[in-house]
């Protein structure tokens, strides 16, 4: 008769680590042994296989490693048949995963006042405790204003105001180990007494005497308190304004009128909002004068006929960048032909006799405009 | 506002072909050239050739040529870069520039080929 | 083709420190009085930008900080005061003929 000298046995494992489950017979003949698996036969893999009798595991997995294993002896040659008793592994595991908004259904539903949960995806067996995390400090269930049970995988703000936001984690310990969340979620509710930015001013680039507007806006309950500064925190008010911002106007929108800009106008303005409670929110724009500067002359050029050449036109420095184009005769080249412009070149192609004379580029923003001959002489052969 | 729009990037097989697009927006590229410059990880910068879109008139580096063909689309307002039988060499990054005068006044914003099999 | 040589391969500067980059040409780059040479900087995973053409003009928009001067094979771009945000690699290019060619580049770093 077959004897199990060693029986396997349930016992508890680590999720990942070593196990082995021992299995001994002791029979008149040769017999062959193998592993059932909730009646299954057991297939060696590099992970879980045959050591002689028993069944070795190289690191214990809670999804394929669960359920009853039995271990079978049998005599091939009378055909008898052994089984020994059922083993199972009582696995102990936790696994990360990332901090979810459960209610309520998406963060576009976020308001003040209301009932915010989140949740800690971390599972595990045994079932891990649970810590909850805001911006890296630790949460305790004494603070009146969200419930969180260290037993409970969910946080609970009530009511959720800005005093709450920040980045949420969690992390969860058992027998097993500890772990902590994958992702973490970022709550942002916004103070209503806070300053937000509705309008930032833009920079702007102006000729000299034309008038220049910033828009700027705030919102905030109650209403934000709005301010604009110059340069050297010289406030801009319609009723203080400072001898070089004379004609300064602020709308009660909040935009920026300034007019006749002359040079002394050109540098920072800040737009500040400042809200019943929070920090001010300072906004920068910079007004700028368009300028042009003096083009470079040309030197003279002599061509010779039927070749190719080009004259470079270098645009003057300005602000804006200016536009650069040619012109002959009083007319503007086309950007193909024979003679045509390409970009800030004059190009010339199979020269005749008959496109001798002045051409004239041209560069302008802004500022106005500049313009620099260049004499071409055809040289015949 | 100037701008010059480069297609993404592309990983090809060594042997294959390649055509990346550059589409102008703030002005016509029939006014301008339009010049291709390779820029292989961590190196200099190679001019390939140029474009003028208006007459389809293109130039290259003699070591691009039979390498790399620039065409261009004036009613899309976009030119192109075909590199052909692709090998490691050609892995780079490759600019597409408008060109004022011979230099490249706006770039985009670059196109990474990666050649691998 | 012209060849461009760029040096110093590297360079570390103070900060409000002066910055020259020098680049010579294998043959004159002049043409009608008209030097094209120019200036381009780089910063990683960006594409060059242009600074200066034609040997010294400035591009609009571009610091006054940044200038370049020489004319015939002999360049140079100066960057004075060194500010943290010109950090970057810098380029020469000649734009006399075809093919249009790069010097090797400059490593701009601050000490």
């Known amino acids: 008769a077959i004897v199990f000298i060693k029986q396997p046995s349930s016992q508890d494992a680590l999720q990942g680590r070593r196990a082995l489950l021992r299995c001994e017979v002791e029979a008149p003949g040769p017999v062959h042994v193998y592993w059932l698996l909730d009646g299954a036969p057991v297939q060696d893999t590099e992970r879980r296989f045959a050591q002689g009798s028993s069944l070795s595991f190289a690191a214990v997995d809670r999804l394929q490693d669960s359920g009853t294993f039995q271990c079978v002896a049998r005599d091939d040659v009378t055909g008898e048949e052994a089984r020994s008793a059922n083993a199972s592994f009582n696995i102990k595991w936790i696994e990360a995963g990332p901090v979810v908004l459960k209610h309520p259904a998406s963060e576009a539903e976020i308001q003040p006042q209301t009932q915010v949960t989140l949740r800690c995806h971390i599972d595990g067996h045994p079932r891990p405790t649970y810590q909850w995390f805001r911006d890296g400090t630790p949460l305790s269930d004494g603070q009146s204003n969200h419930t969180v049970s260290s037993k409970e995988r969910n946080l609970t703000l009530r009511p959720a105001g800005p005093e709450h936001s920040g980045l949420y984690s969690c992390c969860a310990h058992s027998a097993f180990g500890q772990a902590c969340s994958s992702q973490n979620f970022t709550l942002s509710i916004a103070d209503e007494s806070f300053a937000r930015v509705v309008l930032a001013p833009q920079d702007v680039v102006v000729a000299r005497y034309e008038e220049a507007m910033f828009h700027c806006q705030f919102s905030a309950q109650p209403p934000p308190s709005l301010q604009w500064l110059f340069e050297d925190e010289t406030p801009i008010t319609n009723r203080s304004r400072p001898p070089h911002l004379r004609r300064a106007t602020v709308f009660a929108n909040g935009s920026l009128l300034l007019t006749q800009v002359r040079p002394r106008n050109a540098g920072i303005y800040r737009c500040i909002g400042q809200g019943q409670r929070g920090p001010p929110i300072i906004l920068e724009a910079t007004l700028h004068l368009a300028e042009i500067e003096d083009m470079p002359l040309f030197e003279p050029r002599v061509f010779t006929a039927g070749s190719e050449e080009r004259v470079t036109c270098l645009p003057p420095k300005g602000l804006p960048e200016p536009s650069v184009w040619w012109e002959h005769a009083g007319v503007r080249l086309p950007t193909h032909g024979r003679v045509y412009q390409k970009g800030h070149e004059l190009v010339l192609a199979n020269i005749a006799e008959s496109d001798a004379g002045v051409y004239t580029c041209h560069a302008a923003n802004l500022a106005g405009q500049r313009r620099q001959d260049v004499n071409i002489t055809v040289a015949t052969v | 506002e100037v701008q010059l729009q480069q297609s993404g990037a592309e990983l090809v097989k060594p042997g294959a072909s390649v055509k990346l697009s550059c589409t102008a927006s703030?002005?016509?590229?029939?006014?301008?050239?339009i010049h291709w410059v390779k820029q292989r990880p961590e190196q200099g910068l190679e001019w390939i050739g140029r474009i003028d879109p208006a007459n389809g008139n293109d130039k290259y580096d003699p070591k691009f040529q039979g390498k790399a063909t620039i065409t261009a689309d004036t009613s899309s307002n976009t030119a192109y870069l075909q590199l052909s039988s692709l090998t490691s060499e050609d892995t780079a990054v490759y600019y597409c520039?408008?060109?004022?005068?011979?230099?490249?006044?706006?770039w985009g914003q670059g196109t990474l080929v990666t050649v691998s099999a | 083709d012209i060849v461009l040589t760029q040096s110093p391969a590297s360079l570390a500067v103070s900060l409000g420190q002066r910055a020259t980059i020098s680049c010579r040409a294998s043959e004159s780059v002049d043409h009608f009085g008209v030097s094209f040479m120019n200036w381009f900087q780089q910063k990683p995973g960006q594409p060059p930008k242009l600074l200066i053409y034609?040997?010294?003009n400035q591009r609009s928009g571009v610091p006054a900080r940044f200038s370049g001067s020489g004319s015939g094979t002999d360049f140079s771009l100066n960057i004075h005061p060194m500010e943290e945000d010109d950090t970057a690699m810098y380029f020469c290019q000649q734009s006399k003929e075809v093919p249009l060619t790069f010097g090797a580049g400059t490593k701009l770093e601050l000490k």
């Open positions: 034609a040997a010294s």
């Open positions: 703030g002005f016509n590229i029939e006014d301008t050239y």
């Open positions: 520039a408008r060109g004022d005068a011979n230099y490249g006044s706006y």
